[in-house]
Amino acid sequence: SHMAPAHRLQPSDIRKIILELRPMSKGLLQDYLKKEIGLPESNHSSLPCLSSDSQLPHINGSAILPYFRAIRPLSDKNTIDKIIEQLDKLKFQREPEAKVSMAAANFERKNFILAVLQQFSACLEHVLQSLNSGPQHHHHHH
């Protein structure tokens, strides 16, 4: 009932998924920043952005998915559900399907969510830019 594994996706498919993810990611981030006024920009979490399993610049759906599953009970669940469905289409390897733990301290938790949302938005922009600039050699970040 879901799209083929990510290694069969064409650049146009990836672009389409990213264009779906972009407004959801931006909306979540804006809502969170409105709610958590004064929270500093965070490097608390290093969200894996690109996958090295492909010639294309490709979002590492397998690595990012657990972060969104972890923050779902602490964020807008309906938007997160849509993001999870899109990220599932971008999976390469079999993702370990265990659950992700969350930082216990309240401030750490807020930083973690902010970091995930900020870095994911930046990741989407980066991949979209790479896709739009046409076929060329891409450096993969982890």
Partner: antibody, heavy 121, light 111 residues
């Protein structure tokens, strides 16, 4: 759209077992808990337990340990609950409901239509 | 186990008026700065339907007449204004600690 489709009504004899099913569609089954809830006639809701299809992890309400066994089949996106050693006390409507994706429990946002189990000789 | 006490057990409200249902937990259901208390509506012969999640978030597709508030141990579901379609039983439920528990329910009727 997300849907949970439960199996049909069951009439079973005391001492027997019954296996109820809950087929999920419209979302990625393996990422979300499936909860099971009992409702006796004219009564409230009682949580039986949850299963996480991703790794098969389960948690049971002490009241239902030894009575209910939760399993899933990821290939068909179906959750099952087996009820054993049935008595008239087990006559109820049993619901499955989708839960959260994380170690933190969340609300049950989609529910099956319920399966009525009647235990009678 | 966390015990949830709902009050009143039944409630008769005139059309267009406000209905308020209370749910008190035997211990705090807050964690990570969030209240893991949820509200459901159930009509006869139907499964429960999620109305409010995490104390105050309106579930998608639920009318804004429904609202939730509260934290730690004291929570409120408000329906304002009440409509004919709201006749049902309402349950609170906590998901902060296993076992997950429900309140006994509040039956809403029209005066």
């Amino acid at each position: 759209q997300v849907q949970l489709q439960q199996s049909g009504a069951e009439l079973v004899k005391p001492g027997a077992s019954v296996k109820l099913s809950c087929k999920a569609s419209g979302y990625t089954f393996k990422y979300y808990d499936i909860n099971w809830v009992r409702q006796r006639p004219e009564q409230g809701l009682e949580w039986i337990g949850w299963i996480f299809p991703g790794d098969g992890g389960t948690k049971y309400n002490e009241t239902f340990k030894g009575k209910a066994t939760l399993t899933t089949d990821k290939s068909s996106s179906t959750a099952y609950m087996q009820l054993s050693r049935l008595t008239s006390e087990d006559s109820a409507v049993y619901f499955c409901a989708r839960g959260g994706t994380s170690v933190i429990r969340d609300a049950m946002d989609y529910w099956g239509q319920g399966t009525s189990v009647t235990v009678s000789s | 186990d966390i015990v949830l006490t709902q009050s009143p057990a039944s409630l008769a409200v005139s059309l267009g008026q406000r209905a308020t249902i209370s749910c008190r937990a035997s211990e705090s259901v807050d964690n990570y700065g969030i209240s893991f208390m949820h509200w459901y509506q159930q009509k006869p012969g139907q499964p429960p339907k999620l109305l409010i999640y995490r104390a105050s978030n309106l579930e998608s597709g639920i009318p804004a007449r429904f609202s939730g508030s509260g934290s730690r141990t004291d929570f409120t579901l408000t329906i304002n204004p009440v409509e004919t379609d709201d006749v049902a039983t309402y349950y609170c439920q906590q998901s902060n600690k296993d076992p997950l528990t429900f309140g006994a329910g509040t039956k809403l009727e029209l005066k």
